[in-house]
């Protein structure tokens, strides 16, 4: 009779994580007497998948009933697979012996391949906030994906980013990969409601990619315009000075009002205006008691704007002559409005 | 988590012999290799034996015939059985998980043969 | 028996330094090249297998690449607690697997 052999006809097989593998087997003869093992792997550190004989393999099910005596069917089913479980499986006959069984013959091995899908792509920012036409770094990453083929791309508010750099990690085979990418964005000061958007194409996906989004409301400063204005006397002698502060963002803001170097008030910026483009309007008044300065008095609104270096801008208020309305021509937006009666 | 302990070391005279074990815990020692590798003081390392999780053994050449690897997997230990020990021997003896394909996952931190007259 | 030679035997660098160590196989090796760390008093401790993958907990500045006979380990920006003995290791063929001599990375 022609001796034993152990076919394994599939060379390769590719599954779905988290379905079950089907590794097939089939031996030619009956004889000699002795159980099939399955291994993953070769040589010292080939490891046990499966024992027909003895031992606990919770996760591993055999196709035929390996009981019968006339059976040459040894193929088995893996469930639950994971990039982890890729490699090569070898089904291999033992020949009965004492006290153990010997190898007799292996099968040429079935290549397992893993199909898993890449994790949600994350996106993460700058550290720190940054001011209009600054170009700030996005880093978009995902991981445990197979195969190695993969698109990412980048999007700022819909339109296509091209200017990103791209590595997938390992370089060599590997039983699962990574992503990681940079992209550099132009932040404007349109930008408080923009939002950055890297897509993550996969074949595990089936045409509906994974996307991460950042909010740019998270990246951007956008400093304050400062406008200080004397209004119309309100009675003999007192002035009303008003600081506008206008399109700024984030809220956080902190405004103190100084006349003549010494500070006269400080306030935070609480009921604010917000513009359509997402940035802040806020107003402040100061009610100067002229009656109360010999000299000319010289006011000034200073913000300070999360957390950065003040700005100011100073008004001159004369004294000696009759108050009149003075200041910049700027156009009024919406404002809100903060009185504060000092005296 | 996978740890490995080994011992059985100490000083031993040349031509005599000495039983190193492993113990082994935190996988199914059943089912994987294990390997023992050697580095002898100040010197790089050196792959002495394995034992597959079938149970067959490989050799380095300048062992062969001399040591013997062996399992135990109902008490989750390998041996290594130093026979004809020479002072070339002498080095830290490390247990080494093996992996499916061929390299060492996990090490014990060793133990110390010496051997000299 | 596949011979693998590390290079240089001692490198002295200074912390944040880039730094590569070469391994190369007396044959191809299919990719099949490990790295490991060893610090002195303590056991290896494995970084990379299969020339690129790197082992679980192993810190992002480690990266390996290489293919044939040539391999190559890469520490970024080189940390404290990475001077150490290097050792790479084919997993190609077991008969007998082998490594190779270190390169020893100290401060300079």
């Known amino acids: 009779e022609e001796e034993l052999q152990v076919i394994q006809p599939d060379k390769s097989v590719l599954v779905a994580a988290g379905e079950t593998a089907t590794l097939r087997c089939t031996a030619t003869s009956l004889i000699p007497v002795g159980p099939i093992q399955w291994f993953r792997g070769a040589g010292p550190g080939r490891e046990l998948i499966y024992n027909q004989k003895e031992g606990h393999f919770p996760r591993v099910t055999t196709v035929s009933d390996l009981t019968k005596r006339n059976n040459m069917d040894f193929s088995i089913r893996i469930g639950n697979i994971t990039p982890a479980d890729a490699g090569t499986y070898y089904c291999v006959k033992f020949r009965k012996g004492s006290p153990d069984d010997v190898e007799f013959k292996s099968g040429a091995g079935t290549e397992l391949s893993v199909r898993a899908k890449p994790s949600a792509p994350v996106v993460s920012g700058p550290a720190a906030r940054a001011t209009p036409q600054h170009t700030v770094s996005f880093t978009c990453e995902s991981h445990g994906f197979s195969p190695r083929d993969i698109t990412l791309k980048w999007f700022k508010n819909g339109n296509e980013l091209s200017d990103f750099q791209t590595n997938v990690d390992p370089v060599g085979e590997s039983v699962s990969y990574s992503i990681h990418s940079t992209a550099k964005v132009v932040l404007t000061r349109e930008d408080v409601h923009s939002q950055v958007i890297c897509e993550v194409a996969h074949v595990t996906l089936q045409g509906d990619p994974l996307r991460g989004t950042a909010n740019l409301s998270e990246t951007i400063r956008v400093p304050p315009t400062l406008e200080v204005t004397q209004q119309p006397v309100r009675a003999e002698n007192q002035v009303n000075v008003t600081c506008q502060v206008r399109k700024f963002y984030p809220q956080r803001l902190q405004l103190t009002w100084l006349e003549n170097g010494n500070v006269s008030r400080t306030e935070t910026a609480s009921t604010v205006t917000e513009n359509k483009d997402g940035t802040y309007n806020w107003m402040s008044w100061l009610l100067v008691n002229v009656s109360a300065h010999r000299d000319d008095v010289k006011l000034t609104c200073q913000v300070e704007h999360d957390g950065q270096p003040a700005v100011s801008k100073s008004h001159d208020l004369k004294v000696s002559a009759h108050p009149k309305e003075q200041g910049s021509n700027t156009a009024a937006e919406n404002t809100g409005s903060n009185e504060r009666n000092i005296y | 988590d996978v740890q490995l302990v080994e011992s059985g070391g100490g000083l031993v005279q040349p031509g005599g012999s000495l039983r190193l074990s492993c113990t082994a815990s935190?996988?199914?020692?059943?089912?994987?290799?294990m390997s023992w590798v050697r580095q002898a003081p100040g010197e790089g390392l050196e792959w002495v034996s394995a034992?597959?999780?079938?149970?067959?053994?490989y050799y380095t050449d300048s062992v062969k015939g001399r040591f013997t690897i062996s399992r135990d997997n109902s008490k989750n230990t390998l041996y290594l059985q130093m026979n004809s020990l020479r002072a070339e021997d002498t080095a830290i003896y490390y247990c080494?998980?093996?992996?499916?394909?061929?390299?060492?996952?996990?090490w014990g931190l060793g133990t110390l043969v010496t051997v000299s007259s | 028996e596949i011979v693998l030679t590390q290079s240089p035997g001692t490198l002295s660098v200074s912390p944040g330094e880039r730094v590569t160590l070469t391994c190369r196989a007396s044959q191809g090796i299919a990719g099949k090249i490990a790295w490991y760390q060893q610090k002195p008093g303590q056991a290896p401790r494995l970084l990379i297998y299969d020339a690129s993958s790197r082992a679980t907990g192993i810190p992002g500045r480690f990266s390996g690449s290489g293919s044939g006979t040539e391999f190559t380990l890469t520490i970024t920006s080189l940390q404290s607690e990475d001077f150490a003995v290097y050792y790479c290791?084919?997993?190609?063929?077991?008969?007998?697997?082998?490594f190779g001599g270190g390169t020893k990375v100290e401060i300079k």
């Open positions: 034992s597959s999780g079938s149970g067959s053994t």
């Open positions: 080494a998980k093996v992996t499916w394909n061929n390299f060492f996952d996990y």
């Open positions: 290791q084919q997993h190609y063929d077991w008969s007998p697997l082998t």
């Open positions: 935190g996988f199914t020692f059943r089912n994987y290799g």
